[in-house]
């Protein structure tokens, strides 16, 4: 675009240099050239000469009119055709942008990943705005009335050190750009209710050589939370439908879960946990693939025992994946993609 251009005249835009996409736009060019009475004034958009909807208003000024301008960005410049000059003479240039006012941020969620030292808040930004849009996260203590504000572009990480005066907060997000401002709904947050246990990991699996082979899946977490409720989902790699088994877990030792599965099949396992009785789940763990052993000739396989799960007091349900390419539906953004909240001396500029 045109950032610094020495103008020999002026260029201005109505309704303004940033306007709502789809609006009718008039761009004016006024020359102030010495020793030139221009025969013609020309407009260029992104370097290409425009031919239509140009009006010469008077000797020094011309206007180009766009019906329903819908390009997010364009750079405009205008030139003069001066008698006796072989080349056109530059008059002025302007960057113009079109976009939308922001939608109200929706689905605001705040969680604390155990051991992270941060409260991470995410939200849906709505439809693209095409122009620079900022998000201000407001965090107001319900106990002290103190309000903190954080700048963000798509999510925010707030150090729990700055949330020590209180346990209960009101959180909301304000979306702002040149065309408008919208607020999300307010979210009531109790810091004790939004902790997500440290990641659960499936470490290994083995299939025993018994008459009826059983597969034991070993899984663990470094969580310090005592009461944890977990789900393990599993399916053959060729299947669309997940079976889900539920557990009350105590991670003071490695968890072992038993399954009676199809022989000679490749299975995918994933686990996720939450603090018992709370709302927020971990994302599903990385897929763990295990091949069950081949059936020996002696064994009579009983297909009617499908879904081949050792029936204990735990619940088993079936869930169909939307797509075989998407076995891992994230409940929220994975922590690994977040940028770190700027430490002192490490400033993040979203300007």
């Amino acid at each position: 675009g045109i950032t610094s251009i020495n103008c020999s005249g002026d260029m201005w835009v109505e309704p303004g240099e940033i306007f709502q996409m789809g609006m009718n736009v008039s761009i004016y060019c006024q020359e102030a050239l010495k020793h030139c009475r221009p025969r013609n004034l020309y407009f260029y958009k992104n370097g290409f000469k425009e031919e239509f909807d140009i009006t010469r208003i008077n000797r020094t000024t011309a206007r180009i009119w766009y019906k329903g301008f819908s390009e997010p960005h364009a750079y405009m410049h205008c030139t003069a055709e001066c008698p006796g000059h072989f080349q056109e003479t530059l008059i002025c240039g302007k960057d113009i942008s079109s976009g939308h006012p922001p939608d109200a941020p929706s689905n605001l969620t705040c969680v604390i990943y155990e051991y992270s030292g941060n409260m991470t808040c995410t939200w849906n930004t709505g439809k693209p705005t095409y122009i620079d849009t900022k998000y201000i996260v407001h965090v107001k203590s319900l106990e002290t009335e103190e309000e903190q504000q954080y700048l963000a572009s798509s999510y925010v990480k707030i150090s729990t050190d700055s949330l020590q005066g209180s346990r209960k907060y009101l959180v909301w997000v304000q979306a702002v750009n040149s065309l408008g401002m919208e607020n999300s709904q307010q979210l009531h947050v109790h810091l004790d209710d939004i902790v997500i246990p440290s990641a659960s990991i499936i470490s290994r699996a083995e299939t025993t050589n018994d008459t009826v082979p059983k597969t034991i899946v070993y899984w663990k977490s470094k969580t310090m939370i005592e009461k944890v409720f977990c789900e393990m989902r599993y399916k053959t790699t060729t299947n669309q439908t997940w079976s889900v088994k539920e557990f009350d877990a105590n991670f003071t030792y490695v968890q072992q879960s038993e399954f009676y599965l199809e022989p000679d099949s490749k299975y995918v396992f994933q686990v996720r946990c939450q603090e018992t009785g709370k709302r927020n789940w971990q994302p599903w763990s990385s897929p763990f693939v295990h091949q069950t052993s081949q059936e020996t000739g002696k064994r009579n396989w009983q297909p009617w025992s499908s879904p081949f799960v050792h029936q204990t007091s735990q619940t088993v349900s079936q869930v169909t994946a939307k797509s075989s390419h998407e076995p891992q539906k994230m409940e929220m953004l994975s922590a690994t993609i977040f940028r770190g909240h700027p430490a002192s001396g490490n400033h993040q500029d979203i300007g």
Epitope: I136, Q149, L151, S162, N346, H347
Partner: nanobody, 118 residues
Framework: QVQLQESGGGLVQPGGSLRLSCAAS????????MTWVRQAPGKGLDWVSG???????VYADSVKGRFTISRDSAKNTLYLQMNSLKTEDTAVYYC????????????RGQGTQVTVSS
């Protein structure tokens, strides 16, 4: 009692530099977002730059690339480094609590005059 005291203004030629400071007291500066605003002669208040407690910054288009906002929470001080000053930067500069948008900037200091003139 919340107090904000700006300093560092003065007369400077176009293209010159100034560094404004804002000494804060009476509130938890380290947990507060802060903004620089300015008022040109005969005009309303305009925001210039903002910074949150984590150091994330934002700038008005008119000063982007020329001005830099920073903070020192140990000294309870907000700064604005102004380079490549233009005549249109002439204004009274105030520091204020909060971020630029949706604010009336009621909680602000007395201001420091910046005059850019040849």
């Amino acid at each position: 009692q919340v107090q904000l005291q700006e300093s560092g203004g003065g007369l400077v030629q176009p293209g010159g530099s100034l560094r404004l400071s804002c000494a804060a007291s009476g509130f938890t500066f380290s947990r507060s977002a802060m903004t620089w605003v300015r008022q040109a002669p005969g005009k309303g208040l305009d925001w210039v730059s903002g910074i949150d407690s984590g150091g994330t910054t934002v700038y008005a288009d008119s000063v982007k690339g020329r001005f830099t906002i920073s903070r020192d929470s140990a000294k309870n001080t907000l700064y604005l480094q102004m380079n490549s000053l233009k005549t249109e930067d002439t204004a009274v500069y105030y520091c204020a609590i909060g971020l630029p948008w949706g604010n009336t900037w009621r909680t602000r200091g007395q201001g420091t005059q910046v005059t850019v003139s040849s």
